[in-house]
């Protein structure tokens, strides 16, 4: 069965900058993938960024730039201006939409007690939808 | 076939608010962001802010925070800004526009609303 | 906030001629940049994003390039109803409109 991962990290350097890791542990081709805050894709949640391998990515404040960094891994980085709700208590969610195993999305957030620089464990926590 | 449509134009006083709204069809209207833009006569174009209506999440352009607030109300696929305190500057045409992601910002647009602020 | 400053405010341009309009950012806007058209008393339409993705429907003889901080759109071709005034803008961080450029066919 796919599974997805969700990692999300305090940046060392920058206590306002956060970092979102994002894969997809299975066969198939990623066709498209979608980051969320505050709840899943569609249930709740506020789009952050969506990424295509051919389309290219978009993104949205508060993200800042949200990039593959392998065929079925992604990341985002965002930065905390003060506009919205503190991330550290806030949970991503990663919808990864793959051929041809339909969707599946993981959310997850940071450690309560985090340091900088130190992540959530890849423990994914599945939503239980497959579109 | 996406569509917006934008309520009537709208004749009000200084100090007073007014709430325009636009109504979203042909899409699935949680799923994407919608923002509004001003523009003054014979002026350029001016971002005011985004609600994205899933979350009702919101980001405002400083220029408007406290002034403009953007609401939805999902049951009827609508978007609504409310623009209180206003005076001679906020007559202007105001327009929502769906962010079409990937496929680029603002791809469908309403037919604009025609608000005057006159004594 | 990122600043689009647009060039020129106006222009004027004969029938099958070529323009072309820059925008140019305060920062690197990593190609997030999209143009429009507007017409008196019509909404903007959406022509070209991320740089020089032409918007399905729109004619080839519209283009645009550009990257980090300066980018061009051009017209070729020109017609009697590419009259109007053509905005810029970035949507890398926020978003930011260009102040405009009215085009004028002879």
């Known amino acids: 069965t796919p599974e997805v991962w969700v990692q999300v990290q305090m940046e060392a350097t920058e206590l306002s900058s956060f970092t979102v890791h994002c894969g997809f542990l299975g066969p198939g081709s990623i066709s498209l993938v979608t980051v969320s805050w505050g709840g899943p894709d569609g249930a709740g949640g506020t789009k952050l960024a969506v990424l295509h391998p051919e389309l290219g990515t978009r993104q949205w404040a508060p993200a800042r730039q949200a990039r593959w960094e392998t065929q079925s891994s992604i990341s985002l980085a965002l930065e905390d201006s003060g506009a919205s709700s503190p991330f550290a208590n806030t949970t991503f969610c990663c919808k990864f939409a793959s051929f041809p195993e339909g969707s599946w999305e993981s959310c997850g957030s940071l450690p309560p007690s985090s340091d900088p620089g130190l992540s959530a464990p890849p423990t994914p926590v599945p939503i239980l939808r497959a579109d | 076939q996406v569509h917006l449509h934008q309520s009537g134009p709208e004749l009000v006083k200084p100090g007073a608010s007014v709430k325009i709204s636009c109504k979203a069809s042909g899409y699935t209207f949680t799923a994407y962001y919608i923002n509004w833009v001003k523009q003054r006569p014979g002026q350029g174009l001016e971002w005011i802010g985004w609600i994205f209506p899933g979350s009702d999440s919101t980001y405002y352009n400083e220029k408007f925070k406290g002034r403009a607030t953007l609401t939805v109300d999902k049951s009827s696929s609508t978007a609504y800004m409310l623009l209180n305190s206003l005076t001679s500057e906020d007559s202007a045409v105001y327009f929502c526009a769906r962010d079409g992601e990937l496929r680029g910002p603002f791809d469908y647009w309403g037919q604009g609303t025609t608000l005057t602020v006159s004594s | 906030d990122i600043q689009m400053t647009q060039s020129p405010s106006s222009l004027s341009a004969s029938l099958g001629g070529k323009v072309t309009i820059t925008c140019k950012a305060s920062q690197d806007i990593n190609k997030y940049i999209a143009w429009y058209q507007h017409k008196p008393g019509k909404s903007p339409r959406l022509l070209i994003h991320?740089?020089?993705t032409l918007q399905a429907g729109i004619p080839s003889r519209f283009s645009g390039s550009g990257s980090g901080r300066d980018y061009s759109f051009s017209i070729s071709n020109l017609e009697p109803e590419d009259s109007a005034t053509y905005y810029c803008l970035q949507y890398d961080n926020l978003l930011t409109f260009g102040g405009g450029t009215k085009l004028e066919i002879k």
């Open positions: 991320y740089t020089s």
